[in-house]
Amino acid sequence: TPEVWVQVQMEATELSSFTVHCGFLGPGSISLVTVSWGGPDGAGGTKLAVLHPELGTRQWAPARQARWETQSSISLALEDSGASSPFANTTFCCKFASFPEGSWESCGSLPPSSDPGLSAPPTPVPILRADLAGILGLSGVLLFGCGYLLHLLRRQKHRPTPRLQPSHTNSQALTAQAWAPSQASQAALHDPYATINTSFCPATLDTAHPNGWASLPTHAAHQPQGPAASASTPILARGSFVSVENGLYTQAGERPPHTGPGLTLFPDCRGPRAVEGRFGVR
C-alpha cells in the first residue's frame, strides 16, 4: 500500500528556520499536496502550503518556500519568528492526493533527540561541539604531523649517513568531513530532478508534443482507494480545464519535472484565448 513519510528538520545555520520534507512511496500520479500544521487536513489543521504539479504552489505564513524536490516529494521551509519556537513541539502533516483514486496523509514532528540520522539537532550545541571536535582533531593531527616531520628532519641533520628521500604526504588524507544529517528515510525515493519554472504554453514544456498538446507527469502516487475514502487532487493534471488569460499562472511557482507518460492539458497555444477550453473559462 502507498505510504507517506514526513521529516521535520531544524536548520543548522538558522535555528529559527525549520524545513518539512514529505514524500510519497507508491505507484500512481500525485495531483495535489497539502501541508498543514497542528493536525491533519480536516481535523483541526491549519494549512501552510498547497503544491500542484502543474499550476505551482500557494503558501501561507509562516511558510517561507514550498517546492517540489522530486516528482514524489516536496519540501516546505518555515520561518519561526517567535522567540518561544512553537515549531519544536508542532505536528506537521502532508497529504498526497490523486484524483480520483484517493489521498494519503501522514504527520510528523521534530524529534526530541538530535539524532543526525533523523533530523538536524533541535539545539545548536551538538553542531558546535561537532565542529569544535573536528577543528581540534584536525589541528591536533596537523600539529602532530608537523612535530613528527621536524623530528625526522632533526634526526637526518645529525646523521652523516646518506639522506632518505622523504615520502610525499597526501594532502587529501587529512580532510575534515562536515557534519550533515543523513536522509535515511529518503533512500527509496528517486533522485532529485531539475525544477522547471511554471509556464503554460506547451512550446515551453519539455514534454510538449508536436501537435500542441502538453503532457503532464503521471509519476508517484498510489493504488485505488475504497469507495468510502475521501481524496484530493488537482483539476488540471487530470484533464481539466484552465484559463491562462492575462498570464495568471506565469508566476504560479515551481513544478516537479516532467518525465514519463503524461496527461493532456492544453489543446493549443496560439494566444490568450486558445487555452481556455478545459477549466476556469470566464
Epitope: 495531483s31 480536516g42 500542484h52 499550476l55 489521498s103 484530493s232 488540471l236 495568471l248
Partner: nanobody, 120 residues
C-alpha cells in the same frame, strides 16, 4: 473528516435535465472553490464547472449555456443544474472542493461520484 456526498444522477434522455447535489461536511480548511468534475467511460477527468468563494461561476466551454453551478453556504451544499443533456455528457460526476490557482480550482477533496447516463 471531510466528506462530500453527491446525489441526483441517473438515466435521462437526450435533451432532458438533471440536477446534481453535493452535501459537504467536515471542513476545517478554508478552501477557495467548489466544483464539479466528470469522467466519461474510458476517458480522462474533465473539469465541468466551479464556483469561487467570490461566488463567480466558471464553466468549461462545452457546457456553457446548458449547465448552471450554484452553492448554498447555509446548507454547505453545491448544485449542478444540467439542461439540454447530450450523449457526450454521460460520465461519473464528482463534487470537489479545493484551492484556487489563478482561475483554476484544484481539488483537495472530492466525493465518490454519481453516474449520469444520457441515452435514448
Amino acid at each position: 473528516e471531510v466528506q462530500l456526498v453527491e446525489s441526483g444522477g441517473g438515466l435521462v434522455q437526450p435533451g432532458g435535465s438533471l440536477r446534481l447535489s453535493c452535501a459537504a461536511s467536515g471542513f476545517t480548511f478554508s478552501t477557495d472553490c467548489m466544483g464539479w468534475f466528470r469522467q466519461a467511460p474510458g476517458k480522462g477527468l474533465e473539469g465541468v464547472a466551479h464556483i469561487d468563494s467570490d461566488g463567480i461561476p466558471r464553466y468549461v466551454e462545452s457546457v456553457k449555456g446548458r449547465f448552471t453551478i450554484s452553492r448554498d453556504n447555509a446548507k454547505n451544499s453545491l448544485y449542478l443544474q444540467m439542461n439540454s443533456l447530450r450523449a457526450e455528457d454521460t460520465a461519473v460526476y464528482y463534487c470537489v472542493v479545493g484551492f484556487k490557482f489563478g482561475d483554476y480550482c484544484a481539488p483537495n477533496d472530492w466525493g465518490q461520484g454519481t453516474m449520469v447516463t444520457v441515452s435514448s
